[in-house]
Interface confidence: medium
């Protein structure tokens, strides 16, 4: 049975040019996270695998930057950014865990975080 | 050694389905993306799609979105890709090789190629 | 996609000639670019990855440099074995792409 939970930062936005953490946090479970996988819409971000580390999408690898934790830092944003992530828990032996972030890219320059919280 | 080993030559009618396979062996099968590429009569290569036999992540040329699966089978080390509602067009050698996963991405062994006939 | 164009298509060379190819990206790669040599009815084979380092177990002849856009593959002395047909490869954004490949010929 599937006991644990995904926490986000929910709704975030961030000004053009600058950078966004993505996080997400499996709580309530005491499955082991064997990888996370950070998708936008159906492409490969990055992936961390417990065993193999960090594998960045080519995509991806010139603006992103692995963590903190098995979080996501993009970089250079730009309005083309704006959009749903998700970070896809792979646990055992539960099995699959997804959070959503929806980002949204501001032209303007004051970009109101939405939901925030600390990972312990 | 390493050795990617792939199933042998198909002949299918259009419209109809191909499973490819590709054994590997000699190297740590959840270390390394499995990627196709597909090569047709006297033309260049083309990138299908990859996946990485630790978790299944997959992702695929959109070209081929609609049609391709991957698939694995961690316990003899052996990836298939299946590709569906065949048309003349399809009819090429496709290849599978491996990728590291990391940072640098480049193919450092292939599959001896399949070839697979697509004709009414 | 990121379009790789290559050029020539085909050429032909004496043996122990300096042969060049080149390939041009249709946007900036930032030097994610590899090199590989197919023989008629073989797998491709690897020879240069990120624009200039050689993999190993090549010959030294075989050599590769560029950036941004514009990339080129050299073999400093033509051999009667690296007959075969060439392709780059661009990584620096999915889908992967190749270019339509160069087939080199002894003279």
């Known amino acids: 049975m599937m006991t644990g939970t995904i926490e986000t930062t929910g709704n975030i936005s961030a000004e053009k040019g600058g950078s966004i953490i993505l996080q997400c946090h499996l709580s309530s479970t005491t499955a082991q996270v064997t990888q996370v996988n950070w998708e936008q819409q159906d492409q490969l971000l990055a992936i961390c695998n417990a065993d193999l580390g960090w594998h960045i999408s080519p995509s991806f690898k010139d603006r992103v930057a692995p963590g903190p934790g098995l979080g996501l830092t993009l970089q250079s944003l730009t309005v083309n950014d704006t959009g749903e992530y998700f970070c896809i828990y792979h646990t055992y032996p539960d099995g699959t865990y997804t959070g959503r972030i929806f980002l949204e890219v501001l032209e303007s320059s004051v970009a109101e975080h939405g939901a925030r919280f600390q990972i312990p | 050694q390493v050795q990617l080993v792939q199933s042998g030559a198909e002949v299918k009618k259009p419209g109809a389905s191909v499973k490819v396979s590709c054994k590997a062996s000699?190297?740590?099968?959840?270390?390394?993306?499995i990627e196709w590429v597909r090569q047709a009569p006297g033309q260049g290569l083309e990138w299908i799609g990859e996946?990485?036999?630790?978790?299944?992540?997959?992702y695929y040329n959109e070209n081929f979105k609609d049609r391709v699966t991957m698939t694995r089978d961690t316990s003899t080390s052996t990836v298939y890709m299946e590709l569906s509602s065949l048309r003349s067009e399809d009819t090429a050698v496709y290849y599978c090789?491996?990728?590291?996963?990391?940072?640098?991405?480049?193919?450092?062994?292939w599959g001896q190629g399949t070839l697979v006939t697509v004709s009414s | 996609a990121i379009q790789m164009t290559q050029s020539p298509s085909s050429l032909s060379a004496s043996v122990g000639d300096r042969v060049t190819i080149t390939c041009r990206a249709s946007q900036g790669i930032g030097n994610y670019l590899n090199w590989y040599q197919q023989k008629p009815g073989k797998a491709p084979k690897l020879l240069i990855y990120y624009t200039s380092s050689l993999h190993s177990g090549v010959p030294s002849r075989f050599s590769g440099s560029g950036s941004g856009t514009d990339y080129t593959f050299t073999i400093s002395s033509l051999q009667p074995e690296d007959i075969a047909t060439y392709y780059c490869?661009?990584?620096?954004?999915?889908?992967?792409?190749f270019g339509q490949g160069t087939k080199v010929e002894i003279k």
């Open positions: 490869h661009q990584y620096s954004k999915l889908p992967y792409t």
């Open positions: 090789a491996r990728q590291k996963y990391g940072n640098f991405y480049y193919f450092d062994f």
């Open positions: 000699g190297y740590t099968f959840s270390n390394y993306w």
């Open positions: 996946i990485l036999p630790g978790s299944g992540s997959s």
